[in-house]
Interface confidence: medium
């Protein structure tokens, strides 16, 4: 997953400690798991469990690892090349259009509807009308602020910055 980059994600730069491996940049870029030194001569490894980088880069800083919020479980820890993967706890889900928090799944469908999809970490239960079979979200859909329609991509149970 190619998760990029917020101002808060930038880890404070520290002088390379002896345990931080150094290598030379390739075409001015450093490999995943590293960032470039200020003079551009070295690639400095990220610190395991503290920060990471996921792609070839000329970042002056590795990116700070995400800490899972309360209400989330950690699926996989932060490594030097991948951010922490967090997932909503059982019974809650994270919607693509409100990714900052886990929301409780509904416990049942409205009258006249039947459940056709279970609560998952990335979707609420899915209800359809008994007769017509049309889907119902249980809420008035919010007007999405979009640029254009674009090919859809499925939600995945992963940290937003990982």
């Amino acid at each position: 997953e190619s998760a990029l980059i917020t101002q808060q994600d930038l880890a404070p730069q520290q002088r390379a400690a002896p345990q931080q491996k150094r290598s030379s940049p390739s075409e001015g870029l450093c490999p995943p798991g590293h960032h470039i030194s200020e003079d551009g001569r070295d690639c400095i490894s990220c610190k395991y469990g503290q920060d990471y980088s996921t792609h070839w880069n000329d970042l002056l800083f590795c990116l700070r690892c995400t800490r899972c919020d309360s209400g989330e479980v950690e699926l996989s820890p932060c490594t030097t090349t991948r951010n922490t993967v967090c997932q909503c706890e059982e019974g809650t889900f994270r919607e693509e259009d409100s990714p900052e928090m886990c929301r409780k799944c509904r416990t049942g469908c409205p009258r006249g509807m039947v459940k056709v999809g279970d609560c998952t970490p990335w979707s609420d239960i899915e209800c359809v009308h008994k007769e017509s079979g049309t889907k119902h979200s249980g809420e008035v859909p919010a007007v999405e602020e979009t640029v254009t329609s674009s090919p859809g991509t499925p939600a995945s149970p992963c940290s937003l910055s990982g």
């Epitope: 997953e1 190619s2 998760a3 990029l4 980059i5 917020t6 101002q7 808060q8 994600d9 930038l10 960032h35 470039i36 880069n57 000329d58 970042l59 002056l60 800083f61 693509e96 259009d97 990714p99 999405e144 979009t146 640029v147 991509t153 499925p154 939600a155 995945s156 992963c158 937003l160 910055s161």
Partner: nanobody, 125 residues
Framework: EVQLLESGGGEVQPGGSLRLSCAAS????????MGWFRQAPGKEREFVSA????????YYAESVKGRFTISRDNAKNTLYLQMSSLRAEDTAVYYC??????????????????WGQGTLVTVKP
Amino acid sequence: EVQLLESGGGEVQPGGSLRLSCAASGRSISNYAMGWFRQAPGKEREFVSASVWNQGGNYYAESVKGRFTISRDNAKNTLYLQMSSLRAEDTAVYYCVVARTPETPITSARGANYWGQGTLVTVKP
């Protein structure tokens, strides 16, 4: 509402160059992460490159490292992608994306960032 308009796509021979532009309107881009993704026919959308504002630097997919260069002009509210040594496998629709908030990262499959309509790049002899 944020509007993104890509331009600069077209047909080019292998080894050729193109420069894509993405003009943003509706807000200043200076404090927001921006990037480029692409989608080849019959394939999933994939990350190409991303730009961090001010000091941070840039990210590149391994497949474009050393051939593509991302840059931005905050005064013009525009993101660029200079593509050189183009290959047939670079053929795709290229999409510009900008983060929804300063705290929002740009992700490959999630995040509901703002997307442009895309510009087609075709590399063929």
